[in-house]
């Protein structure tokens, strides 16, 4: 079982390989000096049907370096960064993992593109492995809350309450959504 020639790349090079390309072979892409690699640099020859070989993902692309490009902080609810830090310049990558009891959909890594957007795929999503969700929490008088998303919230996520100036928060500041679909505490109050 072998793979066909790896997909070509403009303004870059492909690592050495011999033919036939055996299943398990890795080929690596790199870009010329004034270009930046967007996407996974390594492709793996795999077989899905034990008959034909295929490359496990599309080839990356080489974008002409844009020194003015910068990308916003990427947010993945239920996830966290395991690689990458600000400032995010053209060609920089960020890799995510999901919190406990969350599973990832999509590609774990994204790259800062010349157009100031993350790509070449969408940001991954972290989906709760529990079907239960906690109901939306109420706003509180003289205060507000922040949550990583609106409406019902998946287990493992939290809501943080704060009070307006001149008011004191009484109760729990951070309330966690438990795997049971219940909140870890009742909402606090804001008192003068």
């Amino acid at each position: 079982i072998s793979c066909g020639s790896p997909p070509p790349i403009l303004n870059g090079r492909i690592s050495y390989y011999s033919t036939p390309i055996a299943v398990g072979t890795v080929i690596r892409y790199s870009c010329s000096g004034t270009f930046r690699l967007i996407g996974e640099k390594s492709l793996l020859c795999i077989t899905k049907d034990k008959v034909d070989g295929t490359w496990d993902k599309p080839a990356p692309k080489c974008e002409y370096f844009n020194k003015y490009s910068s990308c916003p902080e990427p947010i993945v609810p239920g996830g966290y960064k395991i690689r990458g830090s600000t400032p995010y310049r053209h060609g920089d990558s960020v890799t995510f993992a999901c919190k406990t009891n969350f599973s990832m959909n999509g590609n774990k890594s994204v790259w800062c593109q010349a157009n100031n957007m993350w790509g070449p795929t969408r940001l991954p999503t972290c989906v709760s492995v529990f079907p239960l969700e906690c109901p939306a929490l109420p706003m509180i008088h003289n205060g507000h809350h922040t949550s990583e998303n609106v409406g019902s919230i998946a287990p493992g996520l939290s809501v943080t309450y704060s009070c307006e100036s001149g008011y004191l928060l009484v109760g729990e500041k951070i309330i966690n959504c438990l795997s049971s679909g219940k909140w870890s505490a009742v909402p606090p109050t804001c008192e003068e």
Epitope: S15, V23, G24, V26, R28, S30, S42, I46
Partner: antibody, heavy 119, light 106 residues
């Protein structure tokens, strides 16, 4: 950090086989590749082959083709290297080493297993 | 197989001084090169990957450079714990190691 723990030292007769294990803990066993690298006494490092556990694909260095078999048990997060038709030149420390995804370089290494081939 | 050649075989340097280790590839390997440190009785430890990126937890005194066929590992100010054997490894086409450079105290 992923920890790789290998089986204990072995003494073998020429012509026999040896099977060394490498148990991984921490991280996701399916998200990395395990290579086997050996080091003869006072010598350098020599790559033998590697397996991608999630795919069950193993590839071998030309020198060891037909004599080495690398396998992995996903249920126990353990990789194995079996070397057959042993000869005295196979006396070495055998290491398992982990590469994240298919990065090509080894972030984590086992402690090594000394295999002595002697009559 | 891509043959990797390291030089010198042994390098004698005094603590506090700079050490420069070389690695040559038999054919172009772009920047697909890693450096490892190995102390007696221990497994190798990753220092540098992609020719110049420092691995997690590796002190800034270790730096790597080069591309194509010529690569260098530099240790800017040698500490007592840096005396060991150093290996380069290519991953352009499968994997292969250099024969090692022993860094010893002068």
């Amino acid at each position: 950090q992923v920890q790789l723990v290998q089986s204990g030292a072995e003494v073998k007769k020429p012509g026999s086989s040896v099977k060394v294990s490498c148990k991984a803990s921490g991280g996701t066993f399916s998200s990395y590749a395990i290579s086997w690298v050996r080091q003869a006494p006072g010598q350098g490092l020599e790559w033998m082959g590697r397996i991608i556990p999630i795919l069950g694909i193993a590839n071998y260095a030309q020198k060891f083709q037909g004599r080495v078999t690398i396998t992995a048990d996903k249920s126990t997060s353990t990789a194995y290297m079996e070397l057959s038709s042993l000869r005295s030149e196979d006396t070495a420390v055998y290491y398992c080493a982990r590469e994240e995804d298919i990065s090509g370089y080894y972030q984590d290494w086992g402690q090594g297993t000394l295999v002595t081939v002697s009559s | 197989e891509i043959v990797m050649t390291q030089s010198p075989a042994t390098l004698s340097v005094s603590p506090g001084e700079r050490a420069t280790l070389s690695c040559r590839a038999g054919q172009s390997i772009s920047r697909y090169l890693a450096w490892y440190q190995q102390k007696p009785g221990q497994a190798p430890r990753l220092l540098i990957y992609d020719a110049s990126s420092r691995a997690t937890g590796i002190p800034a005194r270790f730096s790597g450079s080069g591309s194509g066929t010529e690569f260098t590992l530099t240790i800017s100010s040698l500490q007592s714990e840096d005396f060991a054997v150093y290996y380069c490894q290519q991953y352009e086409y499968w994997y292969s190691f250099g024969q090692g450079t022993k860094l010893e105290i002068k």
